[in-house]
Amino acid sequence: MAVTACQGLGFVVSLIGIAGIIAATCMDQWSTQDLYNNPVTAVFNYQGLWRSCVRESSGFTECRGYFTLLGLPAMLQAVRALMIVGIVLGAIGLLVSIFALKCIRIGSMEDSAKANMTLTSGIMFIVSGLCAIAGVSVFANMLVTNFWMSTANMYTGMGGMVQTVQTRYTFGAALFVGWVAGGLTLIGGVMMCIACRGLAPEETNYKAVSYHASGHSVAYKPGGFKASTGFGSNTKNKKIYDGGARTEDEVQSYPSKHDYV
């Protein structure tokens, strides 16, 4: 029962997370105009991964897509790639996890197959979440770097001229959506991996031994009850799970930087 709940909750959390990653990727507000120097601007600029927008006081909003591919910064391309990889892995993970759900019966699928599918989807969710977190963090780092560079230019590169005010950009809503969504997908993936341990049918480690008492013939099977709990020592399943954990650790080496302006 606890395993089913863990698996179901992992699936739901991952589903929410992936929906968030998709939303963040599509959002236009990855970076928004910093209003510190001009809080009463009548023209507000904001940018996404795919287009940049301008919203006027009049209510008129104009968005222009980045129609060039080669002219875009390599970092932006990298962030796009990370987010798309995250979405694709997450979508495949969701598809796999639907069939792996214990509450859903598909033909005569064995529990061991469901356990493997649960683990696979869990790992996919973990990598998906890490891709999203890495993508958002790379973009945030890029913003912080550009912010301080433009601040330095504002005060040192003017040469006495104060006619042009350089537009500085700060963190947009999409970054926070991305971080939270990536985190949820990661958590969902971990929950799926945990659920996998309890899903696999246990092999008993001891053969049934017959003990002959005087005048009575009773067959006592140690490990019989233990096997049904799902938490017994199972080297085969443990090996699979450890492999998954190792993959998780490897993927977690992605750079993650949360700099607030």
């Epitope: 600029n45 940049s52 009049s58 209510g59 008129f60």
Partner: antibody, heavy 118, light 113 residues
């Protein structure tokens, strides 16, 4: 046809109050940012205040800040300008305007004259 | 605040001739996000409210004759009337639409020579 009709102007003593209204018709009032612009007799144009579409943001000229309040009633298609602590220098024709692309003012009312004098 | 300065204060041009009015802003009105200049031009005839001629520094408002054109970028802008007509006699104002407070130039009075 777009129409903006100001009312509420008149003669008022210094320190007094007045409320200007602007009745809008011929367009979806709630979908536009609106402004008040004034023109002192024989002088140039001076922007007074702006209220954004939803009414959540308002902006004022430094000369009227703290004394004037811009508001709108989208259900009545009406823009207001509450003027308190009036001064002689507030004497002007007050125009109600609609903001469009480029934050430009494409339609202007005929104006209402406010005279502050003792 | 952005200060708008128009020149000349008054201008007399013969009918059919070109009229040029300049407007200078104390800060750039060019928005980097869309590469548009937030400046508009208005025409005001005696006893009438102002009329929008140009927005985004060079985009003509619908219904405005094509003899009116706007140009310039950053801090320097120009309104040009290619062939002056009698009905063009008015006061012309430029306006900063980029940041609050919105500010107008002092106006240029255009007359027929």
């Amino acid at each position: 046809e777009v129409q903006l009709l100001e009312s509420g102007g008149g003669l008022v003593q210094p320190g007094g109050s007045l409320r200007l209204s602007c009745a809008a018709s011929g367009f979806t009032f709630s979908s536009y940012t609106m402004s008040w612009v004034r023109q002192a007799p024989g002088k140039g144009l001076e922007w007074v205040a702006t209220i954004i579409i939803g009414g959540s943001y308002t902006y004022y000229a430094d000369s009227v800040k703290g004394r004037f309040t811009i508001s709108r009633d989208n259900s009545k298609n009406t823009l207001y300008l509450q003027m308190n602590s009036l001064r002689a220098e507030d004497t002007a024709v007050y125009y109600c305007t609609r903001l469009v692309k480029g934050n430009a003012m494409d339609y202007w009312g005929q104006g209402t004259l406010v005279t502050v004098s003792s | 605040d952005i200060v708008m300065t128009q020149s000349p204060d008054s201008l007399a041009v013969s009918l059919g001739e070109r009229a040029t009015i300049n407007c200078k802003s104390s800060q750039s009105l060019l928005n980097s996000g869309n590469q548009k200049n937030y400046l508009s031009w208005y025409q005001q005839k005696p006893g009438q409210p102002p009329k929008l001629l140009i927005y985004w520094a060079s985009t003509r408002e619908s219904g405005v004759p094509d003899r009116f054109s706007g140009s310039g970028s950053g801090t320097d802008f120009t309104l040009t009337i290619s062939s002056l007509q009698a009905e063009d006699v008015a006061v012309y104002y430029c306006q900063n639409d980029y940041s609050y407070p919105f500010t107008f130039g002092q106006g240029t009075k255009l007359e027929i020579k």
